[in-house]
Every structure is written in structure tokens, then in C-alpha cells.
Interface confidence: medium
């Protein structure tokens, strides 16, 4: 039975040209995390393998930095970065936990962080 929950940074906004940290946290489970995948829509951004560490997809190497922790830092944001981001925790024996973050990249300086929320 999957008992864990994923807490994410929720709906967030950031300024064009700036950077943002995408964070997820898996709690309430003793399952072992084998890998965390970060995806934007259907594109793989990065992998954090429990043994080998980070892999950043070649097409995002210039603008994506690993961490902090299992999070992901997006840099040099453009309006095209607006959209859904998913942290996918692969665990044993529970299986897969997925967290969703919506990022809005704003032209002006009115960017604010949204509240944290949980996905069971």
C-alpha cells in the first residue's frame, strides 16, 4: 500500500531572466527512493539516481542545475518556461509518486511564490 505523500512548492511564479527552485519532498513512507525524475510536460529535464547522482538532459544543460537536494534549479527563465513540471519519485516497494508544480514566468517584477500543497 502506498502511504507516502509528496509536498511540492505548488503554484509558483518568477521573473523572466531570473531563476527558480523546484522542490518536492516525499514523506510518510519507508520506501527506498531509487530515482527521481524531473519532467516538463513530456520532456525529461533531469534524473537524480540514488547511486550515481545527477544527469541533466543535454538540451537543458545550460539552464538547469541540480539541487538543492533532490530539487531542480531553472535559470535564465523565459516566458516559454511557463507550464507544468513534475517530480516523479520511483520507490521500492511502493512504486511511483508524482508531484506537480505549475510555474508562471512573468515579464514584470510581480512574481510571487504560491503556497505549498500536498498530493497524496
Amino acid at each position: 500500500m502506498m502511504t507516502g505523500t509528496i509536498e511540492t512548492t505548488g503554484n509558483i511564479s518568477a521573473e523572466k531572466g531570473g531563476s527558480i527552485i523546484l522542490q518536492c519532498h516525499l514523506s510518510s513512507t519507508t520506501a527506498q527512493v531509487t530515482q527521481v525524475n524531473w519532467e516538463q510536460q513530456d520532456q525529461l529535464l533531469a534524473i537524480c539516481n540514488a547511486d550515481l547522482g545527477w544527469h541533466i538532459s543535454p538540451s537543458f544543460k545550460d539552464r538547469v542545475a541540480p539541487g538543492p537536494g533532490l530539487g531542480l534549479t531553472l535559470q535564465s527563465l523565459t516566458v516559454n518556461d511557463t507550464g507544468e513540471y513534475f517530480c516523479i519519485y520511483h520507490t521500492y516497494p511502493d512504486g511511483t509518486y508524482t508531484g506537480r508544480i505549475f510555474l508562471e514566468v512573468l515579464e514584470s517584477s510581480v512574481a510571487e511564490h504560491g503556497a505549498r500543497f500536498q498530493i497524496p
Epitope: 531509487t34 539516481n49 540514488a50 547511486d51 550515481l52 543535454p58 520511483h90 521500492y92 511511483t96
Partner: antibody, heavy 122, light 110 residues
Amino acid sequence: QVQLVESGGGVVQPGRSLRLSCAASGFTFSSYGMHWVRQAPGKGLEWVALIWFDESNIYYADSVKGRFTISRDNSKNTLYLQMNSLRAEDTAVYFCARGYDLLTGYYNFDFWGLGTLVTVSA
Amino acid sequence: QAGLTQPPSVSKGLRQTATLTCTGNSNNVGNRGAAWLQQHQGHPPKLLSYRNNNRPSGISERLSASRSGNTASLTITGLQPEDEADYYCSAWDSSLSAWVFGGGTKLTVL
């Protein structure tokens, strides 16, 4: 079903080169990391090298670093091991083994080939 | 490259229980646990357990793996003649950025 078939082994003189191949079938090769592991006659297993699914990360054992090169051709579903400056102590059966699944990070070393024998002798 | 430490041989009677050990350090076994592989003479290795007790499908429930500190263990209950083989542990070593294997344990079923 998953199949890994090594080839390219043989007898070679010290200091010479050899290239091993591992033909993969029965799974999406481009989604998995791959290993080379060797076993000297009557001895235990020794890990040689690991390559990620897209060649972005490559790791070697100290004993082969600078002499061996692991590579892959995802369009041909084939893993390679280029072995240069061969020594007598490189004599072993060389196995290719499937590594991490890109999608999940699960079951490393879950499928192995039958191996190919490399003998380094004058 | 420093490997993992396994006893060279273990002998147990039919239907008994054997516990094989694999000792490393905090950079390998103590960090992420160990994989266990079985190898019969003249055959390639077969994965029994990955990262402690994660068993691939088709592996007997008579086998269970665990870890305490820097030591991993593989326990085989109700030993059968077909369990006679060499057993290897392996772990990723974060300080070496390399996989390391144990020297192997030859299990004899009497």
C-alpha cells in the same frame, strides 16, 4: 525476451588492442545504462565500466582507466569496449550486463550475456 | 580498488539456513546497500536481490537480503542442491565513483 550477446574476444599479444561488442535485443536499449564486468579464470567478478543510456556519464575501474573505453551505438543496440595496451592480467571472460533503467533507476545487473573470453598472452 | 569482504566459503546441510555476509564501508554498503548475485559454474551471474531486499520477479522467497550498518547479508532458507553456487555482493562506491564487488562466497550444500 532480453538477450545480450558478446563477441570480439580472442587471443591477443600484450600491448595490443581488441574491441568487444555486445548486441542487445528484447528491450529498449537506449533507455538503459550498460556495464562491462570481467572474470579472470577461476577468480571472482570485477566491474570494468558503466555507461549511461545517452553516454553522458561514464565510469571506469581504476585498473582499466586510460586504457579501456566504453561506448555505445543506440541506433544499432550495441555496446562496445575498446581495450588498448592489453596486459596479461586483463585475461578474463568479459560480460556485458544491463544497468539502470532510465525511467525508474530499478534493477541494476538484472540481465547478463554469456561472456566472451579474452586471452592476453605472448 | 578496494572491494567488499565476503567469506570465501560457507557449508550447510540440506534444508538448513545459510547466511552470507558482505562487509564494506559507509561509502558503499553502508550508503546504498548491496546487490547480490548468484553464479553457477560455467554460467553468467544472476541477480538475486538489488539494493537490499528488492527481489526481481522469479527469485525464490527463500532468499532474503538485509543490511545492518556497513554489512549486507543474504539469507537462504530451506537449502536445496541447486543453491550450491558462488554468491557475490556488489555496491556503488560513492567515493570511488565505481562499482565494487566482493570476492565471492562459495556455498556448499552438504
